[in-house]
Structures are given as structure tokens and as C-alpha cells.
Interface confidence: medium
């Protein structure tokens, strides 16, 4: 807590400018009007304040806005955002995507901090759903963002937002998350033709049921082994040897290298040896 002291004569700040870096902490507290600071926040980032000075500026804003900062201030916090605690952020009402982008930019290159996680949570809750633009923004900054959400949270993602998802955004998703995302993707891409549809749906197939895999096997899709290995075991087991052969096309030979790994191992054990032999890969059931 900075002690309240009178501002020395001639030092009252009437603008946020570089001269303030020479002010001691108590002078900043005494000589900078919080409302002036709030309305000239965009200038703060251009001034090389010390961490201690930023603490004083934050303290002034906290006093001015005990119920939480308005968005006009939040949008221009810049590096002062790094001084905020999740408790501070929980008081905010962030509705503008521009504000979200500005703050994510400050944290760019770092892992998702508790502050950022809280900010995103406040933003998404405020919007009611993860719309396409938001998802686009979040995955651009944090490719693993989607997979950090619970299945319950993912259920609020509208199918239209799936268009913003890139394959790498799903790299860390587990089967429960893909179970939620796959039906949305199927709905989103339903009007595309066969080959285009497969390119788009491929990343989501870890949530596909058996009947959809059977349908894909009739479309000469040539699924690669990496995708096949991510399929749900319970969805793969009912597939016949002929269906897997059609599904994988020229990639079927890759089954040999994966015969000890799930879901290939479990699928092999379910097949008749005669059927496996037709593949000519030496797979032993």
C-alpha cells in the first residue's frame, strides 16, 4: 500500500508522458489522477515504467474501479495486464474481440497463464458460445485451446465455428472431446463433395462411430495410418477386413507396422485368420 502524500508543487501530471518514469512511487501515487490514467491508458505501453511503477498505476486503477475495470480501460492495459490476478479479471466484462486480441498479444509466445485462462473464460461466458471469430482468434494464439476445453464447454461450440478449426488445433484432444466435436464437424461439412469432405472431416474422425467409418470405406478416401490410429477402438472393431482395406486404400500395408498397437491390435484379434491372410501382410490374429 502506497502512503497518501501531497503532490509536490509543479509535479501534478496532466498527461501520461515519459516524464513520469522519473517519478518515485509515492510521487506517482500523489501526482497522477486515476481518471486521467484511465483515459490515457493507451500511452502507458509506450513508456518504459518499472514493474514497481506499474504496481502503483494498477493500484490507482483498482481504487478508481473497485468493481472491475471498464472495457475502455481493459483494451489498453497492454503490459499492465501481466500485473492482473485471476481475481481481478473475474470482475471484468469483456465483450469485444478486439479487447481479447489486444490482451492475448501481450501474452504472446508464452504458455497460457491463469490470467489468460480466466480472461478467455470470462469472454466466452459473456458471449454465451464459442463463435467462429472467437475460436479463430483463440486457436491462432493457442493452437491447443480447443482441446483444453471440457466436453461440456465444447458442447456450446456452434457447428459454424468448426470451419475455423485447423488440424493442429485438435492434436491434443482426447476421445471424449472428439466425441463432442465430430457430430458438429459432420453437420458443418455435410454439403461438401466426397473428397473435399474427407479432407475437412479427417481431423475429427477420432469421434466417428462405426457406421460413419463404414460409409467412408465406400468412398475411396485412402485414409492414412496416422488418422486410422486415432480412431475410437470401439468404432474400428466391427469393421470387416474388406472395409478396412477399402478405407485405407494403398495405406493398408501400414497395418503391419502397427500390429502391436491399438486399435490395430484389438481389431486384428477380432478377425478370422482367413480374412487377414487376404491382405497378404502376415498379420496374425
Amino acid at each position: 500500500e502506497v502512503e497518501k502524500t501531497a503532490c509536490p508543487s509543479g509535479k501534478k501530471a496532466r498527461e501520461i508522458d515519459e516524464s513520469l518514469i522519473f517519478y518515485k512511487k509515492w510521487e506517482l501515487e500523489a501526482c497522477v489522477d486515476a481518471a486521467l490514467l484511465a483515459t490515457q491508458m493507451d500511452r502507458v505501453n509506450a513508456i518504459p515504467f518499472t514493474y514497481e511503477q506499474l504496481d502503483v498505476l494498477k493500484h490507482k486503477l483498482d481504487e478508481l474501479y473497485p468493481q472491475g475495470y471498464p472495457e475502455s480501460v481493459i483494451q489498453h492495459l497492454g503490459y499492465l495486464f501481466l500485473k492482473m490476478s485471476p481475481e481481478d479479471i473475474r470482475k471484468w466484462n469483456v465483450t469485444s474481440l478486439e479487447t481479447l486480441k489486444a490482451l492475448l498479444e501481450v501474452n504472446k509466445g508464452h504458455e497460457m497463464s491463469p490470467q489468460v485462462a480466466t480472461l478467455i473464460d470470462r469472454f466466452v461466458k459473456g458471449r454465451g458460445q464459442l463463435d467462429k471469430d472467437t475460436l479463430d482468434t483463440l486457436t491462432a494464439f493457442y493452437p491447443g485451446y480447443l482441446c483444453s476445453l471440457s466436453p461440456e464447454e465444447l458442447s456450446s461450440v456452434p457447428p459454424s465455428s468448426i470451419w475455423a478449426v485447423r488440424p493442429q488445433d485438435l492434436d491434443t484432444c482426447d476421445p471424449r472431446q472428439l466425441d463432442v466435436l465430430y457430430p458438429k464437424a459432420r453437420l458443418a461439412f455435410q454439403n461438401m463433395n466426397g473428397s473435399e469432405y474427407f479432407v475437412k472431416i479427417q481431423s475429427f474422425l477420432g469421434g466417428a462411430p462405426t457406421e460413419d467409418l463404414k460409409a467412408l470405406s465406400q468412398q475411396n478416401v485412402s485414409m492414412d495410418l496416422a488418422t486410422f490410429m486415432k480412431l475410437r477402438t470401439d468404432a474400428v472393431l466391427p469393421l470387416t477386413v474388406a472395409e478396412v482395406q477399402k478405407l485405407l486404400g494403398p495405406h493398408v500395408e501400414g497395418l503391419k507396422a502397427e500390429e502391436r498397437h491399438r486399435p490395430v491390435r484389438d481389431w486384428i484379434l477380432r478377425q478370422r485368420q482367413d480374412d487377414l491372410d487376404t491382405l497378404g501382410l502376415g498379420l496374425q490374429g
Epitope: A35, L36, T39
Partner: antibody
Framework: EVQLQQSGAELMRPGASVKISCKAT????????IEWVKQRPGHGLEWIGE????????KYNEKFKGKATFTADTSSNTAYMQLSSLTSEDSAVYYC??????????WGQGTSVTVSS | DVLMTQTPLTLSVTIGQPASISCKSS???????????LNWLLQRPGQSPKRLIY???KLDSGVPDRFTGSGSGTDFTLKISRVEAEDLGVYYC?????????FGSGTKLEIK
């Protein structure tokens, strides 16, 4: 475009009070001081004081302490100056101006106050 | 309070000729942040004042470049290179460095 629109002329009795308004448009009202200036023929321009609408912070010229009181309403972007216990010395044109740091960059059209019995 | 002394009180100039107004302050107007808050205003007849120059020499937008401000510390000058009819009125210097802000007494520019 920055504009400051002041209330109309006032004819007041000695001892009465008057409240002058200054409505700001075209900029972020809370971000700049509103300055108040008095002009009397033969007396030039005198700075009365200022208010920062965002916080309500005020600064008064010692000469006008007890005479002028500043308020601001950020919901209507309007600043007010009340002058109390009016005498003939208070007859003047009063201007509001936007305080751009240490200079008054935009001025209202002025409000004439005449104190007469 | 800082006293601002303006000279001359009246200036009678022929159109097209130069004009110069002086403003002296009783204290230095250099502020603690390194800036000097000396401004020039023009009040045309029947109008409210309009700022021409701030921070000694910076022209406000829309102000013709025939106006120049100069000076430092306690001595300041406003020059008009070629006076035009629209320049008539009363010119004031005003300081914003020390509270209370104070104005010069004004210089009336008349056209000969």
C-alpha cells in the same frame, strides 16, 4: 468534431446563484479537463479553475474559491459551474474550454451573466 | 501568481506587413517534464477565443504557417509574417505551467 455548447445568457439578482452548463461532443469527455474562464471588459481573461470529469477532481483559482463550484455529469457529457452569492463583480462572460494538457484548445461560445437589481 | 506582461497593447499593421507581439512571464514556464506550456490565443471581435499555438511553437491544425511562436524560459514572441484582414482581433498569451493559469492582458491587432 470537438464542440462545447454553453447554456444561454442569464440575468440575475444580487445574492442569487446561477448554474452554467457546458455540453461536450466529439471527444472522450472524461479524458480531458474542462477549464472555466471569466472575461470582463477591462479585466481581460481570468482562469477560474478546472474539473476532470472522469474522477471529479477539481482545482480552483484561490480567488474564486467559495464563489465557483464545478461538477460534471459523464452520462450526459456535461460540465457545470455554479456561481453563488452573486454581486455586480460577477457580471461577465464565462467560457468553458477543453483543457488539452496545459492549454485550452477548444472553447465554448460563452455565457453572459448579468447581475442587476 | 505568475504575471504575464504583453506588449504592445495595440498594434496597427498594414495588410501584407509583418507583426510581432511579445509576452514575458514573471517566472520560468519550463515545467518539470521538460515542456514549456506557453500558448497563444486569438479572440476575434464578438467571438470566443481560439487557440493558435501551444507549447511555445506548435501550430494548431488549420492555423496558417504565417504564424510562428518562439521563446523559452520567460520571454516569448508571436510573429505574423504577412498580416491578413482575418488576423484582426485581440491576441493573448496564456501560461499553463503554474497554478493558477494566467493570461496576458492582450494585444489588439488593428488593420491600418
Amino acid at each position: 468534431e470537438v464542440q462545447l455548447q454553453q447554456s444561454g445568457a442569464e440575468l440575475m439578482r444580487p445574492g442569487a446563484s446561477v448554474k452554467i452548463s457546458c455540453k461536450a461532443t466529439g471527444y472522450t469527455f472524461s479524458a480531458y479537463w474542462i477549464e472555466w474562464v471569466k472575461q470582463r471588459p477591462g479585466h481581460g481573461l481570468e482562469w477560474i479553475g478546472e474539473i476532470l470529469p472522469g474522477s471529479g477532481s477539481t482545482k480552483y483559482n484561490e480567488k474564486f474559491k467559495g464563489k465557483a463550484t464545478f461538477t460534471a455529469d459523464t452520462s450526459s457529457n456535461t460540465a457545470y459551474m455554479q456561481l453563488s452569492s452573486l454581486t455586480s463583480e460577477d457580471s461577465a462572460v464565462y467560457y468553458c474550454a477543453r483543457g488539452d494538457y496545459y492549454a485550452m484548445d477548444y472553447w465554448g461560445q460563452g455565457t453572459s451573466v448579468t447581475v442587476s437589481s | 501568481d505568475v504575471l504575464m506582461t504583453q506588449t504592445p497593447l495595440t498594434l496597427s499593421v498594414t495588410i501584407g506587413q509583418p507583426a510581432s507581439i511579445s509576452c514575458k512571464s514573471s517566472q520560468s514556464l519550463l515545467y518539470s517534464n521538460g515542456k514549456t506550456y506557453l500558448n497563444w490565443l486569438l479572440q476575434r471581435p464578438g467571438q470566443s477565443p481560439k487557440r493558435l499555438i501551444y507549447l511555445v511553437s506548435k501550430l494548431d491544425s488549420g492555423v496558417p504557417d504565417r504564424f510562428t511562436g518562439s521563446g523559452s524560459g520567460t520571454d516569448f514572441t508571436l510573429k505574423i509574417s504577412r498580416v491578413e484582414a482575418e488576423d484582426l482581433g485581440v491576441y493573448y498569451c496564456v501560461q499553463g505551467t503554474h497554478f493558477p493559469f494566467t493570461f496576458g492582458s492582450g494585444t489588439k491587432l488593428e488593420i491600418k
